[in-house]
């Protein structure tokens, strides 16, 4: 076509893959009648008719564009749907009257690549390699046109550097026409790169402008020789008996050497190898004071057979010995005095405390507890706690029972029990004293006695309710070498269906749910209600 060289540059239309390109025929009215236009695609300088407009009506030509073209904007614009990378070419419209003129449109197609996928070299890199080794591979799939890749180490872009950094990129075209970019970073690394963070960045363009996508950050296994081995103890800080203690060897090389942990025998002063678990960790569980001592670690490089020894580390497992209380089983008269002394050994300064066992009340801060003018109520348990204040949880205790000589003392003097005739009744009677009392009943039945504590006894009696028993009631008598004491249980008939738990009562009562005589092996349970004050 004459004068084609002077034609203006084609109009640029940019569009993303998969969207619709609007190709507007830019011929003026003077240049041609838009109701009579031919549309061509130009590929490798070859024109192909793809669409024709006659009297404002459009018609696709058979071929690759046949299904994707339509006319818009009263015939001035050709719409190309489902754009692909192969559509990146020049389209031109040619007016036929009054004379043949054409208008060229350059279609540019774009597609953002997928998130870059980074894979580190799983074999790792030795620091003493002669030339750059493969560090990682970055793959950016399905982009168009080919994106640019930039590698970063610790947030700084890496540049090609002779014998130090080499970036090797290649791309493949998918059947879709999209590009997959593969970039391999090769580098010579040093020991300090063991913690370095590498990532790749893809730079690409869209109609909206320039964009970029970053891969995740990766670290690369870096291999370097061991220069130093040392011991580490967990938990850090003060250790105590009962703790789980882990002693592990550490080295500044990668891979680490083969470790062994030894403890100095205090008698022979020889280092004796300890048995470690599969991970080379010496686990002391539970730790005991005997585990205290001097430990050291040996690291053996199995490649070079070079052996390195750690600095010895002193391990102290803090302890509190068994607590001893004297006297161990004190017996005293009422009104006398008693001095309880607590002793224990420890690796640290000890604090002593005396507590009343029954209430937990702190009676004394110190190893000696002095009890004056002892009353019956002073009998019972006293606990000495020996603790190390600087190490929470490190303590041992010892319970001592103080016995105050005295005649039996009843839990109650009198009690009313509601019963039904021919029931098997389960009665209980409790007494305390020192020496510990024994309990007898004034009626025949199955009695059993159990010691509640060194000064207290509980007797239970299973008995059949008979008219005679209702008449006489039941007495339990507790006796020891200092005297005897009696409790009386008055039995009263009741209709069980009328007895409710909250029925009002003015006397000290106890209810018994009882079983019929036919179930003589079952027992009832007593529910205590307020008791008389006098306890004898």
């Amino acid at each position: 076509v004459p004068g084609e060289a002077e034609q203006p540059a084609p109009e640029l239309v940019e569009v993303e893959v998969g969207s619709t390109a609007l190709l507007k025929c830019g011929l003026s009215q003077s240049q041609g009648n838009l109701s009579h236009v031919d549309w061509f695609s130009v590929h490798k300088e070859k024109r192909t008719l793809i669409f024709r407009v006659r009297q404002g009506q459009g018609q696709s030509e058979p071929g690759e564009y046949e299904q994707r073209l339509s006319l818009q904007d009263r015939g001035a614009t050709l719409a190309l749907t489902q754009v692909t990378p192969q559509d990146e070419r020049i389209f031109l419209c040619q007016g036929k009257r009054p004379r043949s003129q054409e208008y060229r449109i350059q279609l540019r197609v774009y597609k953002a690549p997928e998130e870059p996928n980074i894979q580190v070299n799983p074999l790792g890199i030795p620091v003493n390699s002669k030339e750059p080794e493969e560090v990682a591979t970055c793959v950016g799939r399905n982009g168009y046109p080919i994106p640019q890749v930039i590698w970063y180490k610790n947030g700084r872009p890496l540049k090609e550097e002779k014998n130090r950094v080499h970036i090797q990129s290649s791309q493949t075209v998918e059947s879709s026409g999209l590009y997959t970019l593969q970039s391999i970073l090769k580098a010579q690394l040093v020991k300090e790169d063991k913690d370095a963070q590498f990532y790749c960045e893809l730079n690409y363009r869209l109609p909206s402008g320039n964009h970029m996508k970053e891969s995740r950050e990766v670290t690369v296994p870096v291999f370097y020789p061991t220069e130093k081995v040392w011991l580490e103890v967990e938990p850090v800080g003060m250790l105590k008996e009962g703790d789980r203690v882990e002693i592990r060897c550490l080295a500044d090389g990668n891979p680490p050497p083969h470790f062994s942990i030894s403890k100095q025998n205090p008698s022979t002063r020889e280092a004796e190898e300890e048995t470690t678990n599969d991970n080379g960790v010496l686990v002391l569980e539970p730790a005991r004071k005997e585990h205290s001592g001097r430990y050291e670690c040996q690291g053996l490089d199995l490649d070079t057979m070079i052996s390195l020894l750690s600095e010895p580390q002193e391990l102290l497992v803090n302890y509190v010995s068994d607590v001893r209380v004297s006297p161990a089983a004190p017996e005293r008269q009422e009104g006398s005095s008693l001095t309880l002394t607590c002793e224990a050994e420890s690796s640290q300064d000890l604090e002593f405390q005396w507590l009343r066992e029954e209430t937990g009340q702190v009676l004394e801060r110190g190893p000696v507890l002095q009890l004056h003018d002892l009353k019956r109520e002073a009998g019972g348990g006293y606990r000495c706690v020996a603790s190390v204040p600087s190490i929470p949880g490190l303590n041992r205790t010892q319970l001592v029972n103080v016995a105050i000589f005295g005649p039996p003392w009843m839990a109650f003097k009198e009690r009313k029990v509601w019963v039904k005739e021919n029931m098997v009744l389960n009665l209980s009677c409790e007494a305390s004293g020192h020496p510990r009392p024994t309990i007898s009943w004034n009626v025949n039945g199955t009695a059993s006695e159990q010691d509640q504590d060194p000064q207290r006894v509980l007797s239970t009696l299973n008995v059949l309710v008979t008219p005679e028993l209702l008449e006489t009631g039941v007495e339990c008598t507790a006796s020891n070498d200092l005297g005897k004491n009696t409790s009386i249980l008055f039995l009263e008939l009741v209709n069980l269906t009328t007895l409710t738990p909250d029925s009002n009562t003015t006397t000290g009562l106890s209810t018994s749910t009882a079983s019929p005589h036919t179930r003589a092996n079952s027992t009832s349970t007593e529910r205590k209600l307020p008791e008389p004050e006098s306890r004898g």
């Epitope: 008269q333 009422e334 006398s336 004056h372 003018d373 005297g483």
Partner: antibody
Framework: EVQLVESGGGLVQPGGSLRLSCAAS????????MSWVRQAPGKGLEWVSA????????YYADSVKGRFTISRDNSKNTLYLQMNSLRAEDTAVYYC????????????WGQGTLVTVSS | SELTQDPAVSVALGQTVRITCQGD??????ASWYQQKPGQAPVLVVF???NRPSGIPDRFSGSSSGNTASLTITGAQAEDEADYYC????????????FGGGTKLTVL
């Protein structure tokens, strides 16, 4: 071996005062209650007073309440009976006595010291 | 409260004799028994339910029922001739003590 040795007895006029002492040995003095028991000539035993091991509690027969005071010095292993406003009927041999472990009754006695109240 | 004893009891040599003591306090406390020979201090012979201090022959025994305590000498010996006193806490539940009036035992 438990030993109880009384001293301080003698002749005193009615209305007068006397202080009896009892030196104890052979046992942990502070752990035991102690008593004074008296026996008038030709008569039976009469309990007079008792004191707890710590000295914190004291007990008296009605016949001597308000006139006699029992006390002890655990550092000296010694029991005392301060007798004031003495009467003729207080004439007796006064025994110092140690309670049994159990308390509440006596297991060892001294040889006694005679107190005579007479004008 | 008081403890009541028979003033005098006699027993033939080698026979068994029972000396009794009555009192309200004996419902709650066991009596202890003392032997006193002329010009000597009393000696504990039986205490508690039925206990003897070391050195006391096993012919001495004690028992209790209701408000009565008993001292039994099985096969009385001449050296058992003495005054015997029962002793108990007061029935008031305080720490006051009381002695019986004593029983003069004669061994015939």
């Amino acid at each position: 071996e438990v030993q109880l040795v009384e001293s301080g007895g003698g002749l005193v006029q009615p209305g007068g005062s006397l202080r009896l002492s009892c030196a104890a040995s052979g046992f942990t003095f502070s752990s035991y209650a102690m008593s004074w028991v008296r026996q008038a000539p030709g008569k039976g035993l009469e309990w007079v007073s008792a004191i707890s091991g710590s000295g914190g509690s004291t007990y008296y027969a009605d016949s001597v309440k308000g006139r006699f005071t029992i006390s002890r010095d655990n550092s000296k292993n010694t029991l005392y009976l301060q007798m004031n406003s003495l009467r003729a009927e207080d004439t007796a041999v006064y025994y110092c006595a140690k309670d049994h472990d159990y308390g509440g009754f006596i297991d060892y006695w001294g040889q006694g010291t005679l107190v005579t109240v007479s004008s | 409260s008081e403890l009541t004893q028979d003033p005098a009891v006699s027993v033939a040599l080698g026979q068994t004799v029972r000396i009794t003591c009555q009192g309200d306090s004996l419902r709650s406390y066991y009596a202890s028994w003392y032997q006193q020979k002329p010009g000597q201090a009393p000696v504990l012979v039986v205490f508690g339910k039925n206990n003897r201090p070391s050195g006391i022959p096993d012919r001495f025994s004690g028992s209790s029922s209701g408000n009565t305590a008993s001292l039994t000498i099985t096969g009385a010996q001449a050296e058992d001739e003495a005054d015997y006193y029962c002793h108990s806490r007061d029935s008031s539940g305080t720490h006051l003590r009381v002695f019986g009036g004593g029983t003069k035992l004669t061994v015939l």
